[in-house]
Amino acid sequence: KPTCDEKYANITVDYLYNKETKLFTAKLNVNENVNCGNNTCTNNEVHNLTECKNASVSISHNSCTAPDKTLILDVPPGVEKFQLHDCTQVEKADTTICLKWKNIETFTCDTQNITYRFQCGNMIFDNKEIKLENLEPEHEYKCDSEILYNNHKFTNASKIIKTDFGSPGE
């Protein structure tokens, strides 16, 4: 049998946010139901994780031997602390789209570990704020965006923006 440390060396995690409790659930992406040591996990999910606090999970299973895999869960900031804001200026709304992630609340997570991503059509931007210029008037554009913490996606949003009519004579 392999060691659990080896077997689960490349385990990945998804973070799910509960807006009522303001707590995260970490979903462990494994095929079998594992044990989580002191942290109880149900159906490979570790519950009630506080934003921006690290949690250590000791992963074991009867298909592998000691030592267990020690997984450090880097819990992201609360999702409601981010808002996708349309920053398009009214006078330029015929040919411009501006989108910005706003941090309306502070949090204790290291901001260095946060990555923003926008995809508008086939254009990809790794920025917190984007401005698309020279667009076609009266066209619909869809922009998908996500935020990652330590390369784990923890929130996403989409905006469909229709550019205004062009000015007469243009």
């Epitope: 920053c87 941090n103 790794d126 401005k131």
Partner: antibody
Framework: EVQLVESGGDLVKPGGSLKLSCAAS????????MSWVRQTPEKRLEWVAY????????YYPDTVKGRFTISRDNAKNTLYLQMSSLKSEDTAMYYC????????????WGAGTTVTVSS | DVLMTQTPLSLPVSLGDQASISCRSS???????????LEWYLQKPGQSPKLLIY???NRFSGVPDRFSGSGSGTDFTLKISRVEAEDLGVYYC??????????FGGGTKLEIK
């Protein structure tokens, strides 16, 4: 190491122009809003310009509006302050400072660069 | 514009004593979102300012717990419970609620009596 390094300060005559630079390193510059803050010879701190992370929004106090322009080049990790129609009251130490968003705080400051406006 | 008035201008203290600095805003700096964006910065001689407190009472990482902030509306206070030699310098309050018109207080110089 997270660092901001200002440069470009000089002695300039009233009515003259000057461009300050602030080189950022050790962090994802394009994710941070940035500001210029100056300190007068009397040691008063004054906020003089603000720019959002992507350069979309800029703000100025009335004392410098129309004379100062803040800009940034995220590809070069550099913040700029173009100053024109300089007055003696613009004499100060100019600091660049990072603020993750408008509702956050200035958590990293540069060491400053000195601008002297005098004939 | 929001005017931030700090008192006293100069504060002579003995090491180990408590120090208290007041900051008053000319109008309420409670934002419509319910938060109050009042910050305190310390500038030591020959250095750039450093953040101590944000949102009235939150200590920035690495700031000793002898520093505490309090207040609401228009009246705010920074307290240092036991002044140490490394605390000497000029303290500035700052309001970030009235975006984008940020304003600093005039500063309070903490010095040895």
């Amino acid at each position: 190491e997270v660092q901001l390094v200002e440069s470009g300060g000089d002695l300039v005559k009233p009515g003259g122009s000057l461009k300050l630079s602030c080189a950022a390193s050790g962090f994802a510059f394009s994710n941070y809003d940035m500001s210029w803050v100056r300190q007068t010879p009397e040691k008063r701190l004054e906020w003089v310009a603000y720019i959002s992370s992507g350069g979309v929004s800029t703000y100025y106090p009335d004392t410098v509006k129309g004379r100062f322009t803040i800009s940034r080049d995220n590809a070069k990790n550099t913040l700029y302050l173009q100053m024109s129609s300089l007055k003696s009251e613009d004499t100060a130490m100019y600091y660049c400072a990072r603020r993750y968003d408008v509702w956050w705080y200035f958590d990293v400051w540069g060491a400053g660069t000195t601008v002297t406006v005098s004939s | 514009d929001v005017l931030m008035t700090q008192t006293p201008l100069s504060l002579p203290v003995s090491l180990g004593d408590q120090a208290s600095i007041s900051c008053r805003s000319s109008q309420s700096i409670v934002h419509s979102n319910g938060n109050t964006y009042l910050e305190w910065y310390l500038q030591k001689p020959g250095q750039s300012p450093k953040l101590l407190i944000y949102k009235v009472s939150n200590r920035f990482s690495g700031v000793p717990d002898r520093f505490s902030g309090s207040g609401s509306g228009t009246d705010f206070t920074l307290k240092i419970s036991r002044v140490e030699a490394e605390d000497l310098g000029v303290y500035y309050c700052f309001q970030g609620s009235h975006v984008p018109m940020y304003t600093f207080g005039g500063g309070t110089k903490l010095e040895i009596k």
